[in-house]
């Protein structure tokens, strides 16, 4: 491991579509990847009339958009599906939205998934 970098070995797993996909609904996912490639965690969610609905959480393959991000933060302005990625074990437990292009003060929606 390189000093100062959080290696990702496991991420929080969640799948809202677990029955159709025939997976667990929630758990911990071990992350696999090629030698010399980094691993990350991700979260995806929707904002339905102000209500946060988690879609999926899990491991994400080597992606420079995620490098050195200890927090899972979506910065895109009003996406249809929110996505964030981060480095460090279980770093996707909490996620937030800070749009970069906002002129007004950005608001954060940190979310901790509630057990079903």
């Amino acid at each position: 491991a390189i000093l100062g970098r959080s290696e990702t070995q496991e991420c929080l797993f969640f799948n809202a579509n677990w029955e159709k996909d025939r997976t667990n609904q929630t758990g911990v996912e071990p992350c696999y990847g090629d030698k010399d490639k980094r691993r990350h965690c991700f979260a995806t969610w929707k904002n339905i009339s102000g209500s946060i609905e988690i879609v999926k959480q899990g491991c994400w393959l080597d992606d420079i958009n995620c490098y050195d991000r200890t927090d899972c933060v979506e910065k895109k302005d009003s996406p249809e599906v929110y996505f964030c990625c981060c480095e460090g074990n279980m770093c996707n437990e909490k996620f937030s939205y800070f749009p970069e292009m906002e002129v007004t003060q950005p608001t954060s929606n940190p979310v901790t998934p509630k057990p079903p």
């Epitope: 090629d34 958009n65 996406p79």
Partner: antibody, heavy 115, light 111 residues
């Protein structure tokens, strides 16, 4: 092992559309991007666009904006690239590739546009 | 994003070393470690050889190495072998906020 298997060759008329599929196996489809690249006969590689397989978010090269649509079906681990308003210059081999680094590639799909 | 610039062709004899350059700008190649190198044999799909400027893919011989100086990335192949004869492309990471771009390709001939 990671595999990307693409649909077969297509012959299309100018003005029509083509939809090429790319079925992924050997890894978790929703853990990365799928990129699409084309190569005209005797020419170099040309990046067309990308899709985040879990969120469905897409980015397209300016050249193809408005003419290309990339989608992903997570239930079948398959990505699709649809190119519309075809012209003869679109005759090329179309490739899908996994991830931002393009670390695994499909075998390619030859699309021939001819009247 | 404009294409990266590569020489059209390079050549070398077996056992020699060759270097292929890939020139971009200060806003792409110069500022980010996100250049990749691909090898393509005729009629085949490209194969990723090096990612992130200098990280060799598993299974790629250590005769292949990547580096960067300023706005130019380079692929060096030492101890040239006949099977190294192919087209080589540099390209950038693509996904999220990053848009992909390739160099025009370099034909390597082993004499």
């Amino acid at each position: 092992q990671v595999q990307l298997v693409q649909s077969g060759a297509e012959v299309k008329k100018p003005g029509s559309s083509v939809k090429v599929s790319c079925k992924a196996s050997g890894y978790k489809f929703t853990s990365s991007y799928i990129n699409w690249v084309r190569q005209a006969p005797g020419q170099g590689l040309e990046w067309m666009g990308t899709i985040n397989a879990v969120s469905g978010s897409t980015s397209y090269a300016q050249k193809f904006q408005g003419r290309v649509t990339i989608t992903a079906d997570t239930s079948t681990s398959t990505a699709y690239m649809e190119l519309s308003s075809l012209r003869s210059e679109d005759t090329a081999v179309y490739y899908c590739a996994r991830g931002g680094w393009f670390d695994y590639w499909g075998q390619g799909t030859l699309v021939t546009v001819s009247s | 994003q404009s294409a990266l610039t590569q020489p059209r062709s390079v050549s070398g004899s077996p056992g020699q070393s060759v270097t292929i350059s890939c020139t971009g700008t200060s806003s792409d190649v110069g500022s980010k470690n996100y250049v990749n190198w691909y090898q393509q044999h005729p009629g085949k799909a490209p194969k990723l050889m090096i990612h992130g400027v200098s990280k060799r893919e598993s299974g790629v011989p250590d005769r292949f190495s990547g580096s960067k100086s300023g706005n130019t990335a380079s692929l060096t192949i030492s101890g040239l072998q006949a099977e190294d004869e192919a087209d080589y492309y540099c390209g950038t990471f693509a996904g999220g906020k990053y848009y992909g771009v390739f160099g025009g390709g370099t034909k390597l001939t082993v004499l």
